[in-house]
């Protein structure tokens, strides 16, 4: 390796590699300076002069140390479905994640593609599996002695009432009716609710509003309308 | 509250050098780049260029290359700018300006340079 | 360089009436970003993103715009409105303003 006080740009030594923060440039066949995040090569190195480095501009970023000649162009706004988790700098892109009541159908490195609205179990199905941030609610039938008499993506399905006299017996979408008595339940209620996915990014404390660009074609496309499954609602 | 506090008025005779500061307050100085804005008495304003703190590195409009150096002292969360060879051209007020992405959201008071012999 | 023009330099307007002023850049630009400066005092960061509003700024105030074409209108002026109002581009360096339009109350 070349002696600590090389300064860039500089030959390396025959089967010798650059340092920390540069690269070989072919053209120059000389280590120069990476331009640092946020940055981009605005002008490339020689024999004689190192790397020039400019910011980012406009909607534009760079994550990593790099000698690209232009930064990479922020993604599109999010669409009405999702949420900008982080918002685009000069040294990060843009992330969008799905709003509540929503989860990602359809992923990318960062963030989501493709939002799609969470399933809701119908009167006579429960929650056998919650929502998360990449997959959708799993309903299930009401056993009997449990029901739901809810259209929910959250709620499992609760043990019927225990009368002392019954007046109406409870089924899979109907608590039972007692008469006259108070009546006792077989067991304790438990969480009725289960949450909605909690994201697990951090949110931004003031995420800077989307720029305006040009328009284009967005990734985040609406979900169209698809067959309910088996004890789900489309509404 | 986000504030940068800049030095005072300089009084300096052609030909010689100045450096202005600006201390930043009220939020982490490397989590934004500090740019430099000159505005000429009853004029627009220019650009000179801006720093990322974290990386120390700069960006400058090529107008102001040689004239203006950009430096910042993480330790104190401030940002210099230091003008050489000046001439009257360069009698002006300097702001630094915070850069939240690609625009300035907090401003100094500005420094007032007048280069007169 | 991107040349940012603004027009008018000067303009007057009475009190509740509707102000425009213009930008344009010799070259597309994304965005654009709008100041606001009072007599002796520093800018104030106006409209940012083309048309999103910075904290404060009165809902009167919307910029609008595209390509090289953008402008900030004031639906109806008030006496605190008078000022200069200087538009920006981030889109290539050097990033530059325009020359301003002086914002009077006739």
């Known amino acids: 390796l070349p002696a600590q006080v090389a300064f860039t740009p500089y030959a390396p030594e025959p089967g010798g590699t650059c340092r920390l923060r540069e690269y070989y440039d072919q053209t120059a066949q000389m280590c120069c300076s990476k331009c640092p995040p946020g940055q981009h090569a605005k002008v490339f190195c020689t024999k004689t002069s190192d790397t020039v480095c400019d910011s980012c501009e406009d909607s534009t970023y760079t994550q990593l140390w790099n000698w690209v000649p232009e930064c990479l162009s922020c993604g599109s706004r999010c669409s009405s479905d999702q949420v900008e988790t982080q918002a685009c700098t000069r040294e990060q892109n843009r992330i969008c994640t799905c709003r509540p009541g929503w989860y990602c159908a359809l992923s990318k490195q960062e963030g989501c593609r493709l939002c799609a609205q969470l399933r809701k179990c119908r009167p006579g199905f429960g929650v056998a599996r919650p929502g998360t941030e990449t997959s959708d609610v799993v309903c299930k039938p009401c056993a009997p002695g449990t029901f739901s008499n809810t259209t929910s993506s959250t709620d499992i399905c609760r043990p019927h009432q225990i009368c002392h006299v019954v007046a109406i017996p409870g089924n899979a979408s109907m608590d039972a009716v007692c008469t006259s008595t108070s009546p006792t339940r077989s067991m304790a209620p438990g969480a009725v609710h289960l949450p909605q996915p909690v994201s697990t990014r951090s949110q931004h404390t003031q995420p800077t509003p989307a720029p305006s660009t040009a328009p284009g074609t967005s990734f985040l496309l609406p979900v169209g309308p698809s067959p309910p499954a088996e004890g789900s609602t489309g509404d | 509250e986000v504030q940068l506090q800049q030095s005072g008025a300089e009084l300096v005779k052609p030909g010689a050098s100045v450096k202005i500061s600006c201390k930043a307050s009220?939020?982490?100085?490397?989590?934004?780049?500090m740019d430099w804005v000159k505005q000429s008495h009853g004029k627009s304003l220019e650009w000179i260029g801006d720093?990322?703190?974290?990386?120390?590195?700069?960006s400058y409009n090529q107008k102001f290359k040689g004239k203006a150096t950009l430096t910042v002292d993480k330790s104190s969360s401030t940002a210099y700018m230091e003008v050489r060879s000046l001439t009257s051209e360069d009698t002006a007020v300097f702001y630094c300006?915070?850069?939240?992405?690609?625009?300035?959201?907090?401003w100094g008071a500005g420094t007032t340079v007048t280069v007169s012999s | 360089e991107n040349v940012l023009t603004q027009s008018p330099a000067i303009m007057s307007a009475s009190l509740g009436e509707k102000v425009t002023m213009s930008c344009r850049a010799s070259s597309s630009v994304k965005n654009m970003y709008w100041y606001q400066q009072k007599s002796d005092a520093s800018p104030k960061l106006w409209i940012y993103y083309t048309s999103n509003l910075a904290p404060g700024v009165p809902a009167r105030f919307s910029g609008s715009g595209s390509g090289n074409s953008y402008s900030l209108t004031i639906s109806s002026m008030e006496g605190e409105d008078a000022a200069t109002y200087y538009c920006q581009q981030f889109t290539s360096s050097p990033y530059t303003f325009g020359g301003g339009t002086k914002l009077e109350l006739k």
């Open positions: 720093i990322n703190p974290n990386y120390e590195s700069t």
């Open positions: 300006a915070r850069d939240k992405g690609w625009y300035f959201d907090v």
């Open positions: 009220g939020y982490t100085f490397t989590d934004y780049n």
